[in-house]
């Protein structure tokens, strides 16, 4: 819980952060490096065929608190990790897919023809 009077808005970094980007490189990235006022991230998720896909890149300060919180999404296996401690810190992030729930075997993409 936030203390009274404490801002819920994330604090702006005094300087730009460079991150590795893969499958998630914006137009202003160069040599698979993007820049941000927020966080670097690495994410793993299943595509439509159930294959794990890893993406990485930059998250802007706006909304990044929510995006980095890794809130579970029904019927979607996904995990995200964020960092800010140094440039390209997301090279060292290795999120893993959450374990399959029993329900996922029934409802999951495996059974879609």
């Amino acid at each position: 819980k936030k203390e009274d009077g404490e801002s819920t808005a994330p604090t702006a970094r005094p300087k730009v952060l460079r991150c590795k980007c893969h499958h998630h490189c914006p137009e202003d990235s160069v040599n698979n490096i993007c820049s941000t006022d927020g966080y670097c991230f690495t994410m793993i998720e299943e595509d439509d065929s159930g294959t794990p896909v890893v993406t990485s890149g930059c998250l802007g300060l706006e909304g990044s608190d929510f995006q980095c919180r890794d809130t579970p999404i029904p019927h979607q296996r996904r995990s995200i990790e964020c960092c800010t401690e140094r440039n390209e810190c997301n090279k060292d992030l290795h999120p893993t897919l959450p374990p399959l729930k029993d329900r996922d075997f029934v409802d999951g993409p495996i059974h879609h023809k």
Partner: antibody
């Protein structure tokens, strides 16, 4: 107040190398990037590259890769730019500049003269 | 590389006049974070550049309010409402959205 102190001038011979210094004060050195910019008379300003003193991460303008090497000494809050294989084309004023998301403070510049 | 085209190259003015300098970039300067990293600097004779305006329209500390920056995307303008003697020098536009960062070729503000 923020200050970036550079030597006023360097005179060097063609083919040699030079290491230009930039001593920062008035702020936390590791909280900002340090950039280096070249200015030749009538040629405008050219971005050489930048270094993050907190982790020594560097980014270079492709044009200056192999020419410039950026380093820092955090214990003395000093940034360095080494220029190698000097020619008359490297004669210019070189500025260090503090960078967060834009350059807000510049050093006074070091005039490099390459001459035999 | 992003090319920054500044006009005019030379701007003769009388003290007290309004001055206007334009800068156009070869591609949009809107960063993926939504910020536009476009800035204006003034280099007075024999000195290093100094920051006037950052992120299109924000005056840096100590910069008089006669300096106004505006624009978006690829087209930007610096207006000086009443030119004073201390405003003379070369004005540079700059972008830090795309690596390598680039500068305009400069506009020399001089007395008519």
């Amino acid at each position: 107040q923020v200050q970036l102190l550079q030597p006023g001038a360097e005179l060097v011979k063609p083919g040699s190398s030079v290491k230009v210094s930039c001593k920062a004060s008035g702020y936390t050195f590791t909280n900002y990037w340090m950039q280096w910019v070249k200015q030749r008379p009538g040629q405008g300003l050219e971005w050489i590259g930048e270094i993050d003193p907190s982790d020594t991460y560097t980014l270079y303008n492709q044009k200056f890769k192999g020419k410039a090497t950026l380093t820092v000494d955090t214990s003395s809050s000093t940034a360095y730019m080494q220029l190698s294989s000097l020619t008359s084309e490297d004669s210019a004023v070189y500025y260090c500049a503090r960078f967060g998301y834009y350059v807000d403070y510049w050093g006074q510049g070091t005039t490099l003269t390459v001459s035999s | 590389d992003v090319v920054m085209t500044q006009t005019p190259l030379s701007l003769p003015v009388s003290l007290g006049d309004q001055a206007s300098i334009s800068c156009r970039s070869s591609q949009s300067l809107v960063h993926s974070t939504g910020n536009t990293y476009f800035h204006w600097y003034l280099q007075k004779p024999g000195q290093s550049p100094e920051l006037l305006i950052y992120k299109v329209s924000n005056r840096f500390s100590g910069v008089p309010d006669r300096f106004r920056g505006s624009g978006s995307g690829t087209d930007f303008t610096l207006k000086i409402s009443r030119v004073e003697a201390e405003d003379l020098g070369v004005y540079f536009c700059s972008q830090s959205t795309h690596v390598p960062f680039t500068f305009g070729s400069g506009t020399k503000l001089e007395i008519k």
